[in-house]
């Protein structure tokens, strides 16, 4: 009896694991083995596929084969007993294109109201992702073990901290990787659960802000209790994106170690140009708080986020405001190559009742004004990155009178 070729060959590639699966074409024939050959692009000869010779099952692993993952290969399979079947040729494929990203490795650390998630690729030093290792982003699904209501968090890096959780509560999460450059979405990790700790008697400091005074940075924060000491630490922000880094070596700001006020002042030259993360911790001598939420601090934005300059065109029932780049000394405009959001405050000159408009655009309409009335306007710029949390000071107020009625066109 002629042996039939195996059918329906599937190639599964997850990270650096290459698995072949196929169907027996004739279940009634016993003691059949299967063998594969492969052929690289531009070659005529077929080579025996190591790891996939004389296989008795319908699955084999050819991960040990050192392939160029960007090069197309072809496979063929046959059945063998006393004689052999004809070869069944599998559609050619490029390993990289076919590969899926495996589940990442996840480590969790719990605080009372936060969880720190450390994520790394599931396959260390992967050949498949060797050129893309730095491009991985991750997304996760988190839920309270007791409720099961899921929250999704997209586009995170190898270390992520989730805040505003409840103490002594078990949270579960799963993480998957993505390579957006290659349109690849990975497989979820197993579910990891962790219980947040008992609530710390000392809350972390809040509302951290940095401003510039003379040649110094002034760091301020809020705290619930008096008679505390505080310390401030910094970290290069880019380290958060480094997938190989699992140890974050936060450094003390010398002038902000054991300070007894809710602010500290340190020279601008402590930091070279760059983006940093800052965090603050409180202590009463016996107990220590968890660290505050980390704020992003960009030395360039910090130094140069100036109030916007604007012109007003007055109509009878509205102002049209045109926002321009702020001016440096010497009247040259400052180029701010990061997205800003503008906060415009306006009020009737004879009243204290302020109204506010928040706009991304640089031309803004202030509606519903009364004719022949003097209104004053001031504006400030905010960075759109919530973690930078940086605002300019307000511009000087500009006051203008609206036109008489029926000039709104």
């Amino acid at each position: 009896k002629n042996l039939k070729s195996p059918q329906k060959v599937e190639v599964d590639i997850i990270d650096d694991n290459f698995i072949l699966r196929w169907n027996r074409s004739d279940e009634s024939v016993g003691n059949v083995t299967f063998s594969f050959d492969y052929q690289k692009t531009g070659m005529d000869n077929w080579i025996k596929l190591s790891g996939c010779q004389n296989i008795t099952s319908t699955k084999c692993n050819f991960s040990s084969l050192k392939l160029n993952v960007y090069e197309e290969i072809k496979l063929r399979i046959r059945a063998e007993k006393e004689n052999t079947s004809s070869w069944y040729e599998v559609d050619s494929f490029t390993p990289f294109r076919k590969a899926q990203i495996g589940p990442p490795e996840v480590h969790l650390e719990a605080e009372d109201k936060a969880i720190v998630i450390h994520i790394s690729p599931g396959t260390k030093d992967s050949v498949m992702w060797a050129l893309d290792g730095l491009s991985f982003t991750y997304s996760l699904v988190i839920w309270k073990n007791s409720s099961g209501v899921e929250e999704r968090i997209e586009n995170i890096y190898s270390r992520h901290k989730i805040y505003k959780l409840s103490p002594e509560t078990t949270y579960c999460l799963k993480v998957k990787a993505a390579l957006l450059t290659s349109w690849k979405i990975g497989v979820y990790s197993p579910v990891h659960c962790i219980k947040t700790t008992v609530e710390n008697e000392l809350p972390p400091p809040e509302n951290i802000e940095v401003s510039v005074q003379n040649q110094n940075y002034v760091l301020k924060w809020d705290y619930t209790y008096a008679n505390m000491t505080f310390q401030v630490q910094w970290l290069h922000a880019f380290l958060k994106r480094n997938p190989g880094n699992h140890l974050y070596k936060w450094k003390q700001i010398p002038d902000c170690e054991n300070v007894k006020t809710t602010q500290c002042v340190f020279p601008q030259n402590v930091f070279q140009k760059g983006i940093y993360l800052l965090r603050v911790q409180a202590s009463d001598g016996n107990n220590t708080s968890f660290w505050s939420e980390e704020i992003k601090f960009d030395t360039e934005i910090q130094a140069f986020l100036l109030p916007p300059v604007f012109n007003i065109r007055s109509l009878s029932d509205s102002f049209h405001i045109y926002i321009g780049a702020p001016k440096q000394s010497g009247n040259t405009p400052v180029i701010q190559d990061y997205p800003l959001i503008y906060e415009i405050i306006f009020w009737e000159n004879t009243s204290n009742a302020e109204r506010k408009i928040i706009e991304k655009k640089t031309d803004v309409t202030v509606p519903n004004l009364k004719p022949l009335t003097v209104y004053c306007v001031k504006a400030r710029a905010h960075t759109m990155d919530e973690k930078l949390n940086k605002s300019s000071v307000f511009s000087d107020a500009v006051c203008e009178k609206t036109k008489p009625g029926n000039t709104s066109k």
Epitope: H107, L108, E109, A110, V116, N200, L247, N287
Partner: antibody, heavy 119, light 107 residues
Amino acid sequence: EAQLQQSGAELVKPGASVKLSCTASGFNIRDSYIHWVNQRTEQGLEWIGRIDPEDGETKYAPKFQGKATMTADTSSNTAYLQLSSLTSEDTAVYYCASWLADYSAMDNWGQGTSVTVSS
Amino acid sequence: DIQMTQSSSSFSVSLGDRVTITCKASEDIYNRLAWYQQKPGNAPRLLISGATSLETGVPSRFSGSGSGKDYTLSITSLQTEDVATYYCQQYWNTLYTFGGGTKLEMK
């Protein structure tokens, strides 16, 4: 595989100094903290301090301030512990250990260096 | 400094026993606790970090639990190779401190 190799046993006289070494393989000490721990005969473990090899920043247990000095040379992937003004109380095994991840602890240990202070 | 107390300095044990070793901190250490195993003549070996996370390669008969100031290392069914001294260590405070150790000895 991450490993730490420590220098050989030392027999030193009271009042003298000694410098112990700890060489890493399988990882870069710049990416870790290196801790030093000692253990006197039949006693428990005692933390001496830690160094960040990347910038030389150190932290010492109060008891070892002035007694121990930690340094590191990233070019040779080696950390050092210098002990000064030695007395018989300093006779112990000294271990180096690496700390490679926030979520872990002292995950790799050297085999230990025995220091005997005797006249 | 945070003091770490291991109440029993030694334990007599038999093969197959369930063993529980306790460790108490002088203040809340919020699960920043590691357990190490040390056999005579050898360097310590990390078993558990974060109070409960088992290190890769550590047998599943070992487990860690606890919170606040009180922590426990459990061995479900003691094997010959588990006879050693066990140390806890806190890392909530950067002046790291070890417990005095608990030695397991065969009856």
